[in-house]
């Protein structure tokens, strides 16, 4: 905590400049006027302050703007952004993509995922939706940051924007996020031909339902194992051995490598061993011949 003292007359601050790097923490606290600091924030990042000193400046801004900083200040935070907590950022209203770019550049490569996620969230809220310009900014300055957004925020993406999303932007997306993005992607790419469609839809397939996966198996797409492993477990389990064979094409041999991993393991347990044997891969764990399968979940649903 910063002690309160009065400012010595010779230390009075009339502008934010490099002389302030020689001020002790309590001198900064006593002598820097918060309103002056806010008005001249554009100078701060060019001055070689220590983070210890930046903490004092942050404290002054927090006192001046207890409800959250205005965008005129946020835009010029520079390395002071590294001192912000998600709780600080949650108070902001950010609409400018220039502000977003500036702060993404500062936070690049640092352990700031929570702060960056909160910042992006504030931008989406401030702009009203996740529009093409915002997506373009995220993909350019923060690959993977799209997946830091909640499914609720992602639901504001118009399908027309989906084309701007690159495969690597979805690498860290979870199933709930892909559940939201997949139908949008399907709509966005619906007029494309088979092979072109598959290339475009592939990164989103972690959100695809069984019927869509079944449809793909009829189109000779030769899905790679990495994509197959990212499919929803519920989408894979109802597939027959023949459908999986058609879906994967020459990549079907990869099932042996993934035999112990979900969703392959769970899918194997659902298949008749006879059917699995037709693949000639030595997959084990299917339902033995002569066993009757009762799906009790259906009976419970009817009663």
């Amino acid at each position: 905590d910063v002690e309160r003292t009065t400012c010595p007359p010779e230390k009075e601050v009339h502008e934010i400049d490099e002389s302030l790097i020689f001020y002790k923490k309590r001198e900064l606290e006593a002598c820097v006027d918060a309103a002056l600091l806010a008005a001249q924030m554009d100078r701060v990042d060019a001055i070689p302050f220590t983070y210890e000193q930046l903490d004092v400046l942050k404290h002054k801004l927090d006192e001046l703007y207890p409800q959250g900083y205005p965008e005129s200040v946020i835009r010029h935070l520079g390395h002071l952004f590294l001192k912000m907590s998600p709780e600080d950022i949650r108070k902001w209203n950010v609409t400018s993509l220039e502000t977003l770019k500036a702060l993404l550049k500062v936070s690049k490569g640092h352990e700031m995922s929570a702060q960056v996620a909160t910042l992006i969230d504030r931008v989406v809220v401030g702009r009203g939706q996740l529009d093409k310009d915002t997506v373009d900014t995220l993909t350019a300055f923060c690959p993977g940051c799209l997946c830091s957004l909640s499914p609720e925020r992602l639901s504001s993406v118009p399908p027309s924007v989906i084309g701007a999303v690159r495969p690597q932007d979805l690498d860290t997306c979870g199933p709930r996020q892909l559940d939201v993005l997949y139908p949008k992607a399907r709509l966005a790419f619906q007029n494309m031909s088979g092979s072109e469609y598959f290339v475009k839809i592939r990164p989103f397939l972690g959100g695809a339902p069984t019927e869509d996966v079944k449809a793909l198996s009829q189109q000779n797409v030769s899905m790679d194992l990495a994509t197959f492993m990212k499919l929803r477990r519920e989408a894979v389990l109802p597939l027959t051995v023949a459908e999986v064979q058609k879906l994967l094409g020459p990549h079907v041999e990869g099932l042996k490598v993934e035999e112990q991993h979900s969703p392959v393991r769970d899918w194997i347990l659902k298949q008749r061993q006879d059917d699995l044997d037709t693949l000639g891969l030595g997959l084990q764990g299917g339902i033995p011949n002569g066993y009757l399968i009762l799906d009790l979940s259906v009976r419970e649903a009817l009663s």
Epitope: P48, F49, T50, Y51, H79, L82, K83, G109, H110, E111
Partner: nanobody, 116 residues
Framework: QVQLVESGGGVVQPGGSLRLSCATS????????MGWFRQAPGEQRELVAR???????MYADSVKGRFTISRDNSKNTVLLQMNSLKPEDTAVYYC??????????WGQGTQVTVSS
């Protein structure tokens, strides 16, 4: 994490000189160059001199014309030549820098005492 080790402190009479050295254990990626700071008993740490990444030097008014900061890149060291020392220069002297991630780093300090 890069270690900073200061040396060269000691007891000196007013008007005397000392040369402080700060050795770094590796390459430093600093946002604001390297600085020499000092802390007198009961006082907060203050910056005395700084050398920026581009070689620009900056000095506190109280030491201008008496202290000189320099860098020897081949030896990964930052030097502080202190001339015309005064009793009010008595303090523990630290070298330090700020990374690009939000952290300040300091050495363990070296004591400088100016006394007759």
């Amino acid at each position: 994490q890069v270690q900073l080790v200061e040396s060269g402190g000691g007891v000196v009479q007013p008007g005397g000189s000392l040369r402080l050295s700060c050795a770094t254990s590796g390459t430093i990626f600093s946002r604001n160059g390297m600085g020499w700071f000092r802390q007198a008993p009961g006082e907060q740490r203050e910056l005395v001199a700084r050398i920026l990444n581009d070689g620009t030097t900056m000095y506190a008014d109280s030491v201008k014309g008496r202290f000189t900061i320099s860098r020897d890149n081949s030896k990964n060291t930052v030097l502080l030549q202190m001339n015309s020392l005064k009793p009010e220069d008595t303090a523990v002297y630290y070298c330090g820098y700020s990374d690009y991630r939000g952290t300040d780093y300091w050495g363990q300090g070296t004591q400088v005492t100016v006394s007759s």
